[in-house]
Interface confidence: low
């Protein structure tokens, strides 16, 4: 299963498989997630250790039992890989680190006006992995506003130093935000030259390409097929790079296939997993387990569920079968790829789906119509669960927001359907940032079922919650993925970093905004909220958020949208935008439906016929 909790002041002892420098625990966790053998990690922030060499140390660990002894270490942070965590698996890391210089090979320097512009330059440079920016207050005048683009052999900094007035971060290419664009073509019978950065065995060129995409230094690849003339090189996938970023030469060569990394694709990246099953093929590797199962698909599921399993072979040899079940060999290797690929066998092989982010994994932890006043523009993929609920009568218009909580489920406010209960008039747009991008050709989801809370009454503020079942399930991408739900009975007191998003009015008597807006709003206790709304009952099933002085709030058109809070590196849906007295008024916080109080209802309504919850439920 998916384990998302972090252990503070704890360090896992032993089990080391790799180490590197990372700016924080979340980035360390991401590197662990993508490392083929890492199950656990420990991170040492600068404050946790005097040894300069170990500051910002990220230690990736493996353990056959899934656990390692934890020792107390003040300031250290430890946790689990997010393998098996479905939509939480992402190589995208947007954070900017102030007062930190991430060292590497500086290959480009330019003057820019902001750290955001520096990050954009890095994202638009094919070789840039991370960057550092010297602010206008940097102590050496000649370096001020310098944007240094960097790379390193492992894709992570070679060192991280605390340095005032320097800001650092990573390329947003893994967020599918590069302006470079990508080459989707696969070139048959063509071999690329240049520097080999790694060599793995793969069953086909598509697996080779995906591995290249997620390798820190691979820009293009050449794959040697299983009929390549040199036996020892069959199924070899060579991951390559060059100074220029493109192959300096290519040679026509029978039974080779070449192509490019897809990391520079805009809006969509391949999933970091390989779902295809290869009949008549055996994958060799270190044996993890052997179990009798019925069918190759069950074998793949078994491999996926056993977190250390990387790939499998399902044997149909008579001696490996009894009754309807045959042996499922669960295997692993140092690099996550088979150590041997054999053809013409009576087996079928494939990979674990533990890094797929489209899975219906049900574990996260890994939680008056009112718009956003006082907010700022959001960026692509920042709030991938946000949807726009639009009504098409004679014209089409945005009415409410909503939150994607599963492949086929959206959570919103019940009052959005006041007077508009017909599901046919609604269109749901997901994975969008600008409403003006919507044309008649833009795909949308239609509603299969609207489930309004049974105790909701029109024009009352209570139980303002509704579920929408979509006619067809949505695929998850960097721009369209669900938000985790809170644990049942979560107290809002743990949440300190909360945001409201929507396309609603930017002032009380305003209009719908084109670009999705975001605003950081603190939660307010129910007691405080009740004082501000003496004519209404603020119940325990509501949560309030707002500034005492006003100025920032949700408003008309934001209803049904998310109030999300980040805790221990994970976003959770804490509230549904519901109502308020005007917008952003002084001492009039926004009132939100408290999602944690409705977990039983959400789980009950989203149960499919097979009894499995089809949304992102809490761990």
């Amino acid at each position: 299963g998916c384990l998302t909790q972090l252990y503070e002041n704890a360090f896992f002892r032993g089990g080391d498989v790799a180490s590197m420098y990372t700016p924080n625990a979340q980035y360390c966790q991401m590197r662990c997630t993508f490392h083929p053998r890492c199950l656990l990690f420990s991170f040492l922030p600068a404050s946790s250790i005097n040894d300069m060499e170990k500051r910002f140390g990220c230690f990736l660990k493996d353990s056959v039992t899934g656990t390692l002894p934890k020792v107390h270490r003040t300031g250290a942070v430890s946790g689990h890989s997010l393998k098996q965590c479905g939509h939480q698996i992402s190589a995208c890391h947007r954070d900017i680190y102030k007062g930190v210089d991430m060292r590497g090979v500086n290959f480009n320097v330019s003057k820019v006006s902001s750290v955001e512009e520096c990050q954009k330059r890095c994202t638009s440079n094919i070789r840039c992995q991370f960057f550092s920016y010297a602010t206008q207050t940097f102590h050496k005048a000649e370096y001020r506003n310098n944007c240094l683009l960097k790379y390193s052999p492992g894709g992570t900094p070679t060192a991280i130093k605390v340095l005032s007035n320097v800001e650092s971060g990573f390329s947003l290419k893994p967020c599918a935000l590069s302006e470079i664009g990508c080459h989707m073509n696969i070139f048959q019978h063509l071999a690329f030259s240049d520097v080999d950065v790694a060599r793995v065995l793969t069953p086909d060129a598509f697996v080779c390409r995906t591995i290249c995409t997620y390798h820190p230094n691979c820009l293009f690849f050449t794959f040697y097929t299983n009929v390549w003339k040199i036996e020892s090189q069959r199924n070899v996938c060579l991951l390559k790079t060059s100074e220029s970023g493109t192959p300096s030469s290519s040679t026509p060569q029978e039974n080779t296939i070449s192509g490019y990394s897809l990391l520079t694709c805009k809006r969509t990246l391949p999933e970091p997993c390989h779902s295809k099953i290869y009949p008549g093929v055996d994958f060799g590797g270190e044996e993890l387990n052997v179990t009798f199962v019925k069918g190759v698909n069950v074998c793949q599921e078994t491999c996926t569920k056993m977190i250390r399993c990387q790939f499998f072979t399902y044997s149909l040899l008579p001696e490996d079968c009894k009754e309807e079940k045959c042996k499922c060999f669960l295997r692993l290797s140092m690099d996550g790829s088979p150590t041997r690929i054999a053809y013409g066998t009576q087996g079928s092989s494939g990979y674990s789906l533990r890094l797929c982010n489209t899975g219906d994994n049900s574990v996260c932890t890994t939680k008056t119509s009112t718009r956003i006043v006082g907010g700022t523009n959001s960026s692509w993929g920042e709030w991938p669960w946000q949807v726009s609920l639009q009504v098409k009568l004679t014209a089409q218009r945005h009415l409410c927001g909503g939150s994607l909580i599963g492949h086929q489920w959206v959570l919103t406010a019940a009052h959005c359907f006041d007077g508009l209960p017909l599901q046919d008039v609604w269109r749901i747009y997901s994975g969008i940032l600008n409403l003006s991008d919507i044309t008649k050709d833009t795909p949308f989801s239609q509603i299969k079922e609207i489930i309004i809370h049974q105790n909701y009454k029109v024009s009352e503020g209570n139980h303002d919650i509704a579920l929408i079942k979509l006619q067809a399930p949505l695929n998850y991408t960097e721009f369209q993925k669900p938000i985790c739900l809170p644990s049942k009975g979560d107290t809002s007191t743990i949440y300190t970093n909360c945001w409201v998003t929507g396309w609603g009015f930017s002032k009380e008597k305003g209009e719908i905004q084109n670009i999705l807006q975001k605003v950081n709003i603190p939660l307010v206790t129910n007691e405080e909220c009740q004082k501000r709304y003496q004519d209404y009952k603020i119940t325990q099933r509501m949560v309030c958020a707002g500034y005492k002085e006003g100025g920032k709030d949700a408003c008309k058109g934001d209803s049904g949208g998310p109030l999300v809070c980040k805790h221990n590196g994970m976003w959770r849906l804490v509230g549904i935008t519901s109502w308020g007295e005007g917008c952003a008024r002084r001492e009039q916080p926004g009132v939100y439906t408290k999602v944690a109080e409705y977990m039983d209802w959400i789980l009950e309504k989203t149960q499919s016929s097979d009894g499995k919850a089809q949304m992102q439920s809490p761990a």
């Epitope: 032993g14 089990g15 080391d16 056959v64 039992t65 387990n289 056993m306 250390r308």
Partner: antibody, heavy 117, light 107 residues
Framework: QVQLQQSGAELMRPGASVKVSCKAL????????MHWVKQTPVLGLEWIGA????????AYNQKFKGKAIFTADKSSRTAYMYLSSLTSEDSAVYYC??????????WGQGTLVTVSA | DIQMTQSPSSVSASVGDRVTITCKAS??????LAWYQQKPGQAPRLLIS???GLEAGVPSRFSGSGSGTDFTLTISSLQPEDVATYYC?????????FGQGTKVEIK
């Protein structure tokens, strides 16, 4: 195939110490943790802790800290559990066990330790 | 520590009967649960684990279910060779803990 061979039964006096051994066969000894479990009629099965022979890392159940010490000898592929200051409450069958995936898939035959004056 | 409570402590049933043993954890163990069978004078034997289900070589009459804190081991049709004590064990957080055991006998 994987086998765990434990040392024979021990009859000990109160206050004495005992060393229980577990020889691992049929797999790479340094790749897998070795765990120890105590079984008594009253308390049933209790996890004592584990050692990773490759790294030497150990984990102990708080209840057995100061009572049990784990060591491992890579050359002889043998894990040891040293129990000190024995009392009648330490009378039990002790198992070494090795995980496969996560739970305990392989067990030794058990070593009966009897503490009696 | 997480407490594992098994019930019943013993059960007597006829050959062919369906036998159900329950195990309750004191907190959510995220499906990190294993079931073991122990026959007199022998070491425990792993039957079922939360990740992979039924272990290789374990008869299909054994099945496990449950989530969160409540788990069940079912023997769909009791056989004479199933006479043993059955234990559940959580491996969600150390110290790993076992249930107190359920003794299964033939009437």
């Amino acid at each position: 195939q994987v086998q765990l061979q434990q040392s024979g039964a021990e009859l000990m006096r109160p206050g004495a110490s005992v060393k229980v051994s577990c020889k691992a066969l049929g797999y790479t000894f340094t790749d897998y943790e070795m765990h120890w479990v105590k079984q008594t009629p009253v308390l049933g099965l209790e996890w004592i802790g584990a050692i990773h022979p490759g790294s030497g890392g150990t984990a102990y159940n708080q209840k057995f800290k100061g009572k049990a010490i784990f060591t491992a000898d890579k050359s002889s592929r043998t894990a040891y559990m040293y129990l000190s200051s024995l009392t009648s409450e330490d009378s039990a069958v002790y198992y070494c066990t090795r995980p496969y995936g996560y739970p305990f898939a392989y067990w030794g035959q058990g070593t009966l330790v009897t503490v009696s004056a | 520590d997480i407490q594992m409570t098994q019930s019943p402590s013993s059960v007597s049933a006829s050959v062919g009967d369906r036998v159900t043993i329950t195990c309750k954890a004191s907190e959510d163990i995220y499906n990190r649960l294993a079931w073991y069978q122990q026959k007199p004078g022998q070491a425990p034997r792993l039957l079922i684990s939360g990740e992979t289900g039924l272990e290789a070589g374990v008869p299909s009459r054994f099945s496990g279910s449950g989530s969160g804190t409540d788990f069940t081991l079912t023997i769909s049709s009791l056989q004479p060779e199933d006479v043993a004590t059955y234990y559940c064990q959580q491996y969600w957080s150390t110290p790993w803990t076992f249930g107190q055991g359920t003794k299964v006998e033939i009437k």
